[in-house]
Interface confidence: low
């Protein structure tokens, strides 16, 4: 997260670090008491590794009590997700068993209703990605608030030159932003998530390189099949 | 399937002010600019301008910014421009034409409307 | 304001032929042009976009080419359905200006 701050401990229970060899590799988000959300991309980096899934923490390194790591039983990439693009940007990891929810673990409603979000609107994204563009990696969990930026202003020429579906949105990039290694990470607008952050390589804290992010409410019917 | 539905041909008298419309359907409004284009015989084709529907902001050629404003109804789709003082210079055909994207790539006014024919007469 | 300049008003061609529609920026616009056609009664449509891009549906005799100031739409094999009026407009910058377009006339 670039241009942020530290975020209160634990009070975001939903959130997760998706982790390759013990390695932060990607944010996620606990939609139900055995899956995470993140994206599709992140398992790329993943290669063989072993893919777990972190709950519960605030600091990567330090003993906490909430804190505990979950094999992956699972990973569901979506089945339209491709390497050279960020459609469908969105990945279900199946955890070996139901979390154990408590304050500092808890599933966050997601978006059904596949309605824009008004530009504008303030949402927060949080993550243990970058914290500067040398590539600065943090130990405790960062957020920051963004302004939803409408579509077809991130879709000019000049921004994201149309790449910019239905199924993704757009938040400001000028000098806060989410980036590399926040990708699978919940944007949450009105204490609901709306979008994923999509793992594309995108430059970050440049205002005319908005955050893309995807859509949950565009695929609703694919997260509850797969839930199912 | 993309489509924009223009309102009928106008006839109006000069000093008068007329406002046409434009409904689009097939696609996410609020998710591409409406732009609006004039055409007439002696200048051939001349964009006036355009406008975010998710916001309103507008864009206009200096040559229209005090001939014609640009307005949205996000509610029903629908994109407007009302053309003010017309003079017998006025009388054209008006587009309304949006540009849609394939994959990452801009596309020029992929759609356009079907024309409103705009006749400036005593 | 960006003029391009569409130096023949009118072409005339024969069926089968090739025929090149040229346009010529005031300024380097980077590739950012469209060609659009026009029928009589119709609205315009647009046939190429960045320069050399075919829109879809658009038939494979319909060539863009160009860069820096000067762009081309070349017809490979004239059919008696592209008889029809040629535009081309820059979208390199604000206000977005169009050619004063070619009208194709068949012999």
């Known amino acids: 997260i670039l241009g942020g701050r530290e975020a209160e401990a634990h009070a975001r229970p939903y959130m997760a670090s998706v982790q390759v060899n013990g390695e932060h590799l990607c944010g996620g988000v606990l939609v139900a008491e055995q899956w995470v959300l993140s994206a599709a991309h992140c398992l790329e980096d993943a290669a063989d590794g072993k893919v777990q899934v972190l709950l519960g923490a605030h600091s990567l390194s330090q003993p906490e009590p909430s804190k505990r790591l979950y094999d992956v039983l699972r990973a569901v990439p979506h089945p339209d997700s491709r390497p050279d693009t960020i459609d469908h940007d969105l990945l279900l990891l199946q955890l070996s068993e139901k979390a154990t929810l408590g304050p500092a673990v808890r599933p966050l409603p997601w978006q059904r209703v596949d309605r824009d979000v008004e530009p504008g609107t303030l949402c927060d994204v949080a993550g243990w990605g970058i914290v500067s563009h040398a590539g600065r990696r943090p130990d405790r969990l960062q957020h920051v608030l963004l302004p939803v930026l409408d579509r077809a202003t991130c879709n000019r020429r000049t921004h994201h030159d149309g790449a910019i579906t239905q199924r993704m949105m757009c938040a400001e990039s000028n000098r806060r932003d989410s980036c590399k290694g926040d990708s699978g990470g919940p944007l949450v607008c009105g204490g609901v998530l709306e979008g994923v952050v999509t793992s594309g390589s995108r430059v970050c804290g440049n205002r005319k390189k908005p955050g893309i992010y995807t859509r949950v409410a565009s695929y609703a019917a694919w997260i509850d099949s797969v839930l199912a | 399937e993309v489509q924009l539905q223009q309102s009928g041909p106008e006839l109006v008298k000069p000093g008068a002010s007329v406002k046409i419309s434009c409904k689009a359907s097939g696609y996410s409004f609020t998710g591409y600019y409406m732009n609006w284009v004039k055409q007439s015989p002696e200048k051939s084709l001349e964009w006036i301008g355009d406008i975010n529907p998710s916001t309103g902001g507008t864009t206009y050629n200096q040559k229209f910014k005090a001939k014609a404003t640009l307005t949205v109804d996000k509610s029903s789709s629908t994109a407007y421009m009302q053309l003010k003082s017309l003079t017998s210079e006025d009388s054209a055909v008006y587009y309304c034409?949006?540009?849609?994207?394939?994959?990452?790539?801009?596309?020029?006014?992929?759609?356009w409307g079907q024309g409103t024919l705009v006749t400036v007469s005593a | 304001d960006i003029v391009m300049t569409q130096s023949h008003k009118f072409m005339s061609t024969s069926v089968g032929d090739r025929v090149s529609i040229t346009c010529k920026a005031s300024?380097?616009?980077?590739?950012?042009v469209d060609w659009y056609q026009q029928k009589p009664g119709q609205s315009p449509k647009l046939l190429i976009y960045w320069a050399s891009t075919r829109h879809t549906g658009v038939p494979d005799r319909f060539t863009g080419s160009g860069s820096g100031t000067d762009y081309t739409l070349t017809i490979s094999s004239v059919q008696a359905e592209d008889l029809a009026l040629y535009y081309c407009?820059?979208?390199?910058?604000?206000?977005?200006?169009f050619g004063g377009g070619t009208k194709l006339e068949i012999k």
């Open positions: 300024q380097d616009v980077s590739t950012a």
């Open positions: 034409a949006t540009p849609y994207y394939y994959g990452s790539s801009y596309v020029g006014f992929a759609y």
């Open positions: 407009q820059q979208h390199y910058s604000t206000p977005w200006t």
